[in-house]
Amino acid sequence: MKVLQEPACVSDYMSISTCEWKMGGPTNCSAELRLLYQLVFQSSETHTCVPENNGGVGCVCHLLMDDVVSMDNYTLDLWAGQQLLWKGSFKPSEHVKPRAPGNLTVHTNVSDTVLLTWSNPYPPDNYLYNDLTYAVNIWSENDPAYSRIHNVTYLKPTLRIPASTLKSGISYRARVRAWAQHYNTTWSEWSPSTKWYNSYREPFEQR
């Protein structure tokens, strides 16, 4: 049994780190493999993660952790029974992928404006809470040529779009993702998308 692509891990800077890797051939990850992790810290214990399959030769493991601080460093050991396949280390604060924003809602009852709101995925006491900026993707299933990214660089998780900039009488979808500039993170996954119908019509004089 051989590791084809070494484990690569990212942390949500809250309570979970996700490690993914590829094996040299088809593997039943949960039956054949264990990923052991231990914080380099006085009197810490070794913890075990049971991986799941992620495609035929891919494995993924979700490591449960305490809150992340910048000093944290983990040793990682990938075992197949008594055989050590790979040994490495992981510093969560240097490999952060934020959680995806949630509760994306579209408010169309505001005159002339489409208001999008969503929730910050972190509690206020988390360091990432005040560091997230967002990208909102809006597209139309009726008009495949229309797709826009709106960068939200302020803290408030809202975006206002003049309804007049969207075509009337067709449906739109939106999704949002986040990243934290000062932590040099990757982008989060996209939130689930939400759909709305743009019924806005320009006043008669402007037609």
Epitope: L39, F41, Q42, S43, S44, E45, T46, H47, L64, M65, D66, V69, S70, M71, D72
Partner: antibody
């Protein structure tokens, strides 16, 4: 009541051996790391050894490394210190102390918040 | 090894007066914000040490509020706002950042 009671001290000749025991009660013994600290007559406190809750990680002062072995039996709620190749400078009162909660991924530290009454080890010919 | 240097080594105090003991570590004991791995212990004559302060500033259960700990990184202080006769003994700082844990030399607090 959270309590630690040491035993096993005594008079031993240089080169001899002793095994100290520390019985814990009133807390979930296996969840906590444990530590031995000693105090030579008229001197300050000196850390000797520590062990994680499961016993998988052990730590020793350079002065005792290779001679002393820390261990625990969680089924008996008891901590041990096996002392071999004893020297005159090992003469001290030995205390066991409750250390950090080590079942969490990052052990939680509350100080050495419970200490035993101490057991005296005298190494002399 | 981390060296803990305590001062003063002897501290004569009048009852009701404040007292202060300093401890300097040879390297930072700050692991993350609010988590300085330094403790303060009091050992009264003929007794086992007892925990006063842990993580730099957190008062242990049952410790009177006249005891307080402060500092961060390498410099730490134990303050007693009003010394009482029962406070006499040896005070030790200890770093628990990593092994080997190391203690200061001890400060003997006595009543004038």
């Amino acid at each position: 009541e959270v309590q630690l009671v040491e035993s096993g001290g005594g008079l031993e000749q240089p080169g001899g051996s002793l095994r100290l025991s520390c019985a814990g009660s009133g807390f979930t013994f296996r969840d906590f790391a444990m530590t031995w600290v000693r105090q030579a007559p008229g001197k300050g406190l000196e850390w000797v050894s520590s062990i994680s809750g499961s016993g998988s990680s052990t730590y020793y002062a350079d002065s005792v490394k290779g001679r002393f072995t820390i261990s625990r039996d969680n089924s008996k709620n008891t901590l041990y210190l096996q002392m071999n190749s004893l020297r005159a400078e090992d003469t001290a009162v030995y205390y066991c102390a409750k250390d950090r909660l080590s079942v969490t991924v990052r052990p939680r530290y509350y100080g050495l918040d419970v200490w035993g009454q101490g057991t005296t080890v005298t190494v002399s010919s | 090894d981390i060296v803990m240097t305590q001062s003063p080594l002897s501290l004569p105090v009048t009852p009701g007066e404040p007292a202060s003991i300093s401890c300097t570590a040879s390297q930072s004991l700050l692991y993350s914000i609010g988590y300085n791995y330094v403790d303060w212990y009091l050992q009264k004559s003929g007794q086992s040490p007892q925990l006063l302060i842990y993580l730099g500033s957190k008062r242990a259960s049952g410790v009177p509020d006249r005891f307080s700990g402060s500092g961060s990184g390498t410099d730490f202080t134990l303050k007693i706002s009003r010394v009482e006769a029962e406070d006499v003994g040896f005070y030790y700082c200890m770093q628990a950042y990593n092994s080997p844990y190391t203690f200061g030399q001890g400060t003997k607090l006595e009543i004038k």
